[in-house]
Interface confidence: low
């Protein structure tokens, strides 16, 4: 019995059509991706294809105006018009807390929304249950097919769930729920989450009874053969792992933004075991034509966010590269970009002894969501930066020792690779790694610049002396694992809308040219 | 304690339309599905549909495709069964009943007392 | 859709006796089976859900067994309060489809 599983994760908001970055489209002959796209290719391996599944390993939300403006309902709206049959809650999905998941998107989905490793507690337990469940047993064609869902358990590090959802380890909360499928008689089970394709691989390996793992969170792009954009194959898709039984287990992951489609066939023999897995991702690219229904739609919706954001700021000279692959690795120059802004928004100057009252900004590089394109006529809005910055967070003054902010720098890169948020953009500092060194002893130099100057240098950082630093609430709050700032800060003040700072900044500069200048380095 | 209160016993002409109410207390409304079924005097049970009051997913036994409507107000509690163009072997008593969809309980584990539909010219 | 077989229609018993009532699926149903009492001007009540978990507050007495497509539910010893009609049925998949009924009645 074959099965088709198409899949998609990490859309982030993506649901016109985008350039070949993901950033917004500017010459639609060459963009990609979009929910009316997506439809057609669907829909074509629908009628060609007897046993199909379309599945989502989470984050629909967040990333681009679409979810500014809308806030999930566009999410419900159109996974339901494209027919999902599952999707799995990722960390981007409590972004606007458990009410910005309830109301919009769980009440309204026509389609089972899926974590075991998720558990409600509290006045929360009664509200939310039977929104989302654990599993869902699923009829394809004469046969069933169980879809168990996870979500990374760093959830409460990476968005607002809450103090009433308990984020379970995801092994230990998948198994009783296989299991409880394996007592229902259902012998073909696929795990859809959202914890990254390290996790994946674990729980292929780990999990009795996966059959197969479908996930998200990490952007892994797995291709076999030669691929046919920019993105470069972590690995042959499917990625065959044998599990601790001796199973061979296909993992897959479809990149990020609704660029590709997962196209996995998997043929299973009577008892429900794997026999062959073979697919690709299909890359959703101008020469597939976008639906007409869902594009109207679109296009319906889309007449609210025209009036929202369209102006113009200023302009850009350079190419802002805010792509995950720069700014989780190394010095990017959105994040060079973003960090001045936040200074310039706190400039103070109040005491002759002090050309500033702060001088250093830390930046997250996993904020950073979205590049801008310098060849829109360099055109910045308010929408490009939406995408750039889509969390709605502020930029806030704290006050750190200096011990609390080389714990920082450390954190920053104590994975360095993974491409993890936590890698610091920086302002204000300058910044040595020697990555082999081992984790918690990497910062080889750490300078920050003096405030208490005329004239503005770079000095080593003083383990006992108190400096004010700019730094996203979200950092502020302990956010991608900065718990020693939060448990540590000795004052916190809130400062105003990210975004906004921005613009702000970029409007008063009128054209902009940040550059990648040495601020982080590796020996 | 968990209730599902229905509305009272109908009288109605063929081809005619009518509607039963079910208000639900005791628990999360929108955390269970909610199933119509049907018993004709002396006879079986029968399964109409079901609607998932949470997300508003209604799923329909074709056999009543098209004269069925389920839907619910989540505001009051209630869940609604409408049956169209009304003939003779429609008279029973017509049940909701919950359905706790998380998890392996399948089954239907509480019920309202029922609502006597009586087509009669 | 899938067809409930429930036998037997009808069945003398006393109090006491051991009591076995059995459903046959037209398909696999994957233990998917429930099974209900129902007294004459109530509605059923759950007694049995997934083939052999007896609902909260059900006597031991009654107790189920089954897979694929042969569902049996077992009454060990019948007390006077449990003469009524049984039904199974499949949740397995939709329509969920009962059995014709076994009505239990006093030897």
């Known amino acids: 019995w074959e099965l088709t599983i198409l899949h998609t994760n990490d859309v982030h908001s993506r649901l016109e059509q985008t350039s070949e970055d993901s950033s917004k489209c500017v010459n639609a002959s060459r963009c990609m991706g979009g929910v009316a796209r997506l439809f057609t290719k669907v829909q074509q391996i629908r009628r060609a294809e007897p046993n199909v599944l379309l599945l989502d390993a989470g984050d629909q939300y967040q990333g681009t105006i679409w979810f500014t403006v809308y806030k999930g309902a566009e999410v419900a709206h159109f996974m339901n018009a494209l027919r999902y049959d599952a999707m799995a809650l990722g960390n981007h999905e409590f972004d606007n807390g458990v009410e910005g998941l309830i109301e919009p998107l769980l009440k309204e989905a026509k389609f089972p929304i899926l974590s075991a490793n998720i558990k409600a507690k509290g006045p929360l337990a009664s509200q939310i249950s039977g929104l989302y469940l654990p599993y869902k047993v699923l009829p394809v064609g004469d046969e069933v097919v169980g879809i168990v869902g996870y979500t990374s358990k760093e959830t409460p590090f990476l968005s607002n769930p809450g103090t009433n959802l308990v984020f379970e380890d995801e092994i230990t909360a998948l198994q009783p729920e296989v299991d409880k499928l394996k007592t229902l008689n259902v012998n073909k089970i696929i795990a859809l989450g959202h914890s990254g394709f390290e996790m994946d691989k674990l729980i292929a390996q780990k999990v009795r009874g996966v059959d197969v793992v479908v996930g998200g969170h990490s952007n892994t792009f797995l291709y076999t053969g030669n691929p046919p954009s920019k993105e470069v194959p972590a690995g042959k898709y499917p990625f065959i792992v044998t599990s601790d039984d001796g199973r061979k287990v296909p993992v897959v992951q479809a990149y990020a933004f609704g660029k590709y489609l997962g196209y996995l066939k998997i043929e299973f023999d009577e008892r429900g075991n794997v026999i062959s897995s073979h697919g690709n991702p299909i890359l959703l690219n101008s020469s597939i034509p976008e639906d007409p229904s869902i594009k109207a739609d679109i296009n319906k919706w889309r007449i609210k966010l025209d009036n929202y954001s369209t102006q113009e700021l200023g302009k850009t000279i350079v190419y802002l590269d805010g792509s995950s692959q720069s700014c989780r690795f190394r010095e990017c120059n959105m994040g060079n970009l973003i960090c001045d802004a936040m200074i310039n928004n706190n400039l103070r100057h109040t005491d002759e002894m002090f050309w500033n009252h702060v001088s250093m900004c830390i930046l997250n590089g996993g904020g950073i969501r979205s590049p801008i394109d310098e060849r829109n006529n360099g055109t910045i809005t308010w929408e490009n930066l939406a995408a750039v910055l889509p969390f709605g967070g502020t930029f806030d003054l704290v006050q750190l020792k200096g011990s609390t902010l080389k714990k920082a720098f450390e954190h920053s890169v104590h994975r360095y690779g993974q491409s993890t948020g936590e890698f610091l953009q920086v302002g204000g500092i300058h910044v040595v790694y020697d990555l082999s060194r081992k984790p918690g002893d990497r910062v080889v130099k750490l300078d920050v610049l003096c405030t208490k100057c005329r004239v503005p240098s770079y000095d080593p950082l003083k383990m006992d002396e108190v400096y004010k630093v700019i730094l996203p609430n979200f950092l502020a709050n302990g956010g991608d694992g900065f718990q020693m700032i939060k448990d540590e800060l000795l004052r916190h003040d809130s400062g105003d809308q990210d975004i906004n700072v921005v613009s702000t900044y970029i409007s008063k500069m009128k054209v902009i040219y940040p550059a990648v200048e040495g601020r982080i380095k590796f020996s | 304690q968990v209730q599902l209160v229905q509305s009272g016993a109908e009288v109605k002409k063929p081809g005619a339309s009518v509607k039963v109410s079910c208000k639900a207390s005791?628990?999360?409304?929108?955390?269970?599905?909610l199933s119509w079924v049907r018993q004709a005097t002396g006879q079986g049970l029968e399964w109409m549909g079901e609607?998932?009051?949470?997300?508003?997913?209604?799923y329909y036994n074709e056999k009543f495709k098209g004269r069925v409507t389920m839907t619910a107000n989540t505001s009051i509690s209630t869940a609604y069964m409408e049956l169209s163009s009304l003939r003779s072997e429609d008279t029973a008593v017509y049940y909701c009943a919950r359905y706790d969809y998380l998890g392996s309980s399948y089954g239907f584990d509480y019920w309202g007392a029922g609502t006597t539909v009586t087509v009669s010219s | 859709d899938i067809q409930m077989t429930q036998s037997p229609s009808s069945l003398s018993a006393s109090v006491g006796d051991r009591v076995t009532i059995t459903c046959k699926a037209s398909q696999d149903v994957s233990t998917a089976v429930a099974w209900y009492q129902q007294k004459p001007g109530k509605a059923p009540k759950l007694l049995l859900y997934s083939a052999s978990y007896r609902y909260s507050g059900v006597p031991s007495r009654f107790s189920g067994s089954g897979s694929g497509t042969d569902y049996t539910l077992t009454i060990s010893s019948l007390q006077p309060e449990d003469f009524a009609t049984y039904y199974c049925q499949q949740h397995y998949n939709t329509p969920y489809t009962f059995g014709g009924g076994t009505k239990l009645e006093i030897k």
């Open positions: 005791g628990y999360t409304f929108t955390s269970y599905g």
């Open positions: 609607i998932y009051p949470g997300s508003g997913n209604t």
